[in-house]
């Protein structure tokens, strides 16, 4: 298959990845589906440098990222190892808070107004960021 060598229209290139920043809000799962239909994934933050880049583009607005613990342990949507990877939680977060009255705890991670991360109810309609890597195969094999 072919490889993507430049970013799609309306996406921003940075360090061999392409980023798309929403201006509307969706629940985490719907944002996740949206990115997948763009042949991308919710943003996976792997360094302080990438954190600053994303933070610069989203501003002081709650924004979903590709990190969740809906099945137990915290996991990045692209398989990046959580335990050994970059983290930027707010103090005392994640706390899986149950006091919001919406049922259940908090299983999805988002950037807060200062860029640090918080876990929140996955149904909240936050903005989101999609990411796709350049130079990865962007095409299924041709149909026979």
């Amino acid at each position: 298959g072919s490889e993507r060598t430049c970013c799609p229209v309306n996406w921003v290139e940075h360090e061999r990845s392409c980023y798309w920043f929403s201006r509307s809000g969706k629940a985490w799962a719907d944002a996740d589906n949206y990115c997948r239909l763009e042949d991308a994934h919710l943003v996976v933050v792997t360094s302080w440098e990438e954190q600053k880049f994303v933070q610069h583009h989203i501003g002081p607005v709650n924004t979903w990222m590709g990190l969740h613990d809906q099945n137990g342990p915290w996991k990045w949507v692209d398989g990046t190892d959580y335990e050994t990877g970059f983290k930027n939680w707010r103090p005392e977060q994640p706390d899986d808070w149950y006091g919001h009255g919406l049922g259940g705890g908090e299983d999805c991670a988002h950037f807060t107004d200062d860029g640090r991360w918080n876990d929140d109810v996955c149904q909240r309609p936050y903005r989101w960021v999609c990411e796709t890597e350049l130079d990865k195969a962007s095409q299924e094999p041709p149909l026979l």
Epitope: P8, N10, S22, A27, R36, L37, P125
Partner: antibody, heavy 120, light 108 residues
Framework: QVQLVESGGGVVQPGRSLRLSCAAS????????MHWVRQAPGKGLEWVAV????????YYADSVKGRFTISRDNSKNTLYLQMNSLRAEDTAVYYC?????????????WGQGTLVTVSS | DIQMTQSPSSLCASVGDRVTITCRAS??????LNWYQQKPGKAPKLLIY???SLQSGVPSRFSGSGSGTDFTLTISSLQPEDFATYYC??????????FGQGTKVDIR
């Protein structure tokens, strides 16, 4: 101009298979997700399936999951819907439509449709 | 899944009438709401996207409003070519993308 043309419809017996095609022209087909939407005679619109621009992600309505497969060949600017184990309730006009996305998304344009009739 | 309910299911109107069609979502969909027009034997055509944005080429007599769960499509002065069926559709929680059952606008 942007155009979508469906083909492959016809009369088929229950339990049999059919493959629909949708030929696209007038736009960069490989840059857009694509949908199939159907409309039973005298009824409303029902979303069937969607495929991402590169074909790596696909979603289906519960009513067709496990029986229908959406695929695409970007080198031929063509979208497909493979329909297996067809049932009488699959009788409908099947439309392909381009997925236009900007955070919000909608269906535009639509093909003219192809009629599938499942009957013994 | 989010259910979309249109009312009325059908209506009769005369040329020049002001026509209003409503669409209600089973839960909040913010402004993720589109409208389509379908004439008999033809494919649907995008009319309005994101509640109130008119698709290119759509006459200004068509307008959309609303937010959250309640939305309205208005035709300010019905023309002969407007007799058709109109569908609302949500894209907030998708898949699945869901449509209203349609509103048929007939000539009185």
């Amino acid at each position: 101009q942007v155009q979508l043309v469906e083909s492959g419809g016809g009369v088929v017996q229950p339990g049999r298979s059919l493959r629909l095609s949708c030929a696209a022209s007038g736009f960069t087909f490989s840059s857009y997700g694509m949908h199939w939407v159907r409309q039973a005679p005298g009824k409303g619109l029902e979303w069937v399936a969607v495929i991402s621009s590169a074909g790596s992600n696909k979603y289906y309505a519960d009513s067709v999951k496990g029986r229908f497969t959406i695929s695409r060949d970007n080198s031929k600017n063509t979208l497909y819907l493979q329909m297996n184990s067809l049932r009488a309730e699959d009788t409908a006009v099947y439309y392909c439509a381009r997925r236009y996305s900007s955070g919000w998304d909608w269906f535009d344009p639509w093909g003219q449709g192809t009629l599938v009739t499942v009957s013994s | 899944d989010i259910q979309m309910t249109q009312s009325p299911s059908s209506l009769c109107a005369s040329v020049g009438d002001r026509v209003t069609i409503t669409c209600r979502a089973s839960r909040n969909i913010s402004n993720y709401l589109n409208w389509y027009q379908q004439k008999p034997g033809k494919a649907p055509k995008l009319l309005i996207y994101v509640v109130s944005s008119l698709q290119s080429g759509v006459p200004s007599r068509f307008s959309g409003s609303g937010s959250g769960t309640d939305f309205t499509l208005t035709i300010s002065s019905l023309q002969p070519e407007d007799f058709a069926t109109y569908y609302c559709q949500q894209s907030y929680s998708s898949p699945p993308w869901t449509f209203g059952q349609g509103t048929k606008v007939d000539i009185r």
